[in-house]
Amino acid sequence: YHGCPSECTCSRASQVECTGARIVAVPTPLPWNAMSLQILNTHITELNESPFLNISALIALRIEKNELSRITPGAFRNLGSLRYLSLANNKLQVLPIGLFQGLDSLESLLLSSNQLLQIQPAHFSQCSNLKELQLHGNHLEYIPDGAFDHLVGLTKLNLGKNSLTHISPRVFQHLGNLQVLRLYENRLTDIPMGTFDGLVNLQELALQQNQIGLLSPGLFHNNHNLQRLYLSNNHISQLPPSVFMQLPQLNRLTLFGNSLKELSPGIFGPMPNLRELWLYDNHISSLPDNVFSNLRQLQVLILSRNQISFISPGAFNGLTELRELSLHTNALQDLDGNVFRMLANLQNISLQNNRLRQLPGNIFANVNGLMAIQLQNNQLENLPLGIFDHLGKLCELRLYDNPWRCDSDILPLRNWLLLNQPRLGTDTVPVCFSPANVRGQSLIIINVNVAVPSVHVPEVPSYPETPWYPDTPSYPDTTSVSSTTELTSPVEDYTDLTTIQVTDDRSVWGMTQAQSG
């Protein structure tokens, strides 16, 4: 193998790997024909002048997870064939100017998870062929104008997990080939108008977990190819009416965890490829007519954990493809009988943790394919006669934690429940709240002094692909839940945000900071 250092392993395929704490300097002599070199998990603290001088055929160089804190400017001299260079997971605070000079073939440069305090235009001015630049997980507070001006071929730029407080509108102006821009987990409070105007080929823009309060109306108007836009966990309080109007390719939009108070009609659209919209954890108080009318392919709509008290009868117009609708943990007291009429393909609806006092008899009239309805923890005292009769596929119905009034008017509901007991699940059954003499007794077996014929309990369809329920009686909070936590439910196990119950502000469905996309 043309000489392999004792602390390394060398393969026939010209691959060299040097690992271990006993390594304190770049091993020598390295095989002259090496094409891939990995130096991982060592105690190397610095790279001196030209340690790779004799391996000029090198294509990939990974120097990761070391103690590296200092590099001399000529460390990578004579590596003109190098295409991939990773210095990730080290302790670099400063990059010397000219470090990447002569790396004319370099396409991928990974500098993530270091301690870099600043970058300068001169750092990357020689890297004209660079396609990927990873700078996430550093301590960058600002990006100077011109920093990326020479990287005209760049397709992927990650600046996430830094300390950026503002972005110059000119910093990305020459990156016309950029497809992925990640700015997540910074301290950005606003994005100047025009910042993304030059990014005509952008497909993914990650702005989640910042402190953005306002979006300028035309912020995304030049990004017609945008497919994924992450805006979750910011401080956005309103959406300018036209902000999403020029995004026909969008297939992922996250807005959860903001401060949105209202959504104007037609705010989303047209977005023919958007299939899921997550709007939970905002401050939305009402839904006007046609607010989602451009989202004709939407399959999943999550509106849980808002403050919705009013839904206009035409709010869900256009959502003909919707399969799952989550409205749990809001402030709904009443629903118009026609509000779900257009949702002909709806399978799962979660309305638990609201203040619903009654339901119109025709509320589910046109939603014949419903399989799961969550109505627990509301203020329901009774339900209209025949409200569920036409729902032949219904196999999960949650009615517990309501103040059922067990007088003679409850008989039709009681009889239906008796016939359909398997649909109620086995863990928690609805119980009477009034009159006082029957409080706490099961609604299904309560004696209301009227003879009830013996009934045959029919077989119920197997459980559907219902939304995410909690499978555990107590809900973990994000301070203690690891990212491997699985929430599973008492009856099913689909711990989907559409129906998860949340008992306090910390219980965000086992979601941790690491899970923010």
Partner: antibody
């Protein structure tokens, strides 16, 4: 390049458990659904369930409820499926696969992990 | 659960000829916009590979000799001109409810 790399073949005794891993790379792990599919020897495909790494939420085929536990570790972009109380009929190749949206097709698949249950 | 019945179980077709595989669902898996039916190809010792999603949408990178059609309960996968590398088992899958697969159709060269 999108890749799902699964752990190696396992031979297990009846009554024991096995944990199969699926390491994802080349895409944003938390942004996709991860499905698990069973294929018994000479048989067709059977959907076990899915996990959504963004929230750790799961959905099982009722047949595998109590048999398969699906979890994720987002720090290592790895999905896991643990099968408990193994029986001979659990002998199969198990695949993980990726789906863009919940109802979408599975567009990338792992190479499969063979689990053999034998005394 | 929705039952998917594929026909035929196996199919022998000459190179360059058309191959047609059918999949019937026990209930409709379509809306006015979409059919929640997908097609996969599996070669021996390999994982399945997505060919067609939502009944008729060709997955990127898949040769255009593959096409899908149908709605409601009846769906078809067509290979317009069979190539040697198309020898495999083909499966339909529905994602309307709990996902289920068809039993598979083995395609061979005559």
């Amino acid at each position: 390049e999108v890749q799902l790399v699964q752990s190696g073949a396992e031979v297990k005794k009846p009554g024991s458990s096995v944990k199969v891993s699926c390491k994802a790379s080349g895409f944003t792990f938390t942004d996709y659904y991860i499905h698990w599919v069973k294929q018994a020897p000479g048989q067709g495909l059977e959907w076990i369930g899915l996990v959504y790494p963004y929230i750790g939420g799961t959905n099982h085929n009722q047949k595998f409820k109590g048999k398969a536990t699906l979890t994720v570790d987002t720090s290592t972009t790895t999905a896991y499926m643990e099968m408990s109380s193994l029986r001979s009929e659990d002998t199969a190749v198990y695949y993980c696969a990726r789906g863009d949206n919940k109802y979408d097709a599975m567009d990338y698949w792992g190479q499969g992990t063979t689990v053999t249950v034998s005394s | 659960d929705i039952v998917l019945t594929q026909s035929p179980d196996s199919l022998a077709v000459s190179l360059g000829e058309r191959a047609t595989i059918n999949c019937r669902a026990s209930q409709s898996v379509s809306t006015s916009s979409y059919s929640y039916m997908h097609w996969y190809q599996q070669k021996p010792g390999q994982p399945p590979k997505l060919l067609i999603k939502y009944a008729s949408s060709l997955e990127s990178g898949v040769p255009d000799r593959f096409s899908g059609s149908g709605s409601g309960t009846d769906f078809t996968l067509t290979i317009s001109s069979l190539q040697a590398e198309d020898v495999a088992v083909y499966y339909c899958e529905q994602s309307w409810e709990i996902r289920t697969f068809g039993g598979g159709t083995k395609v061979e060269i005559k």
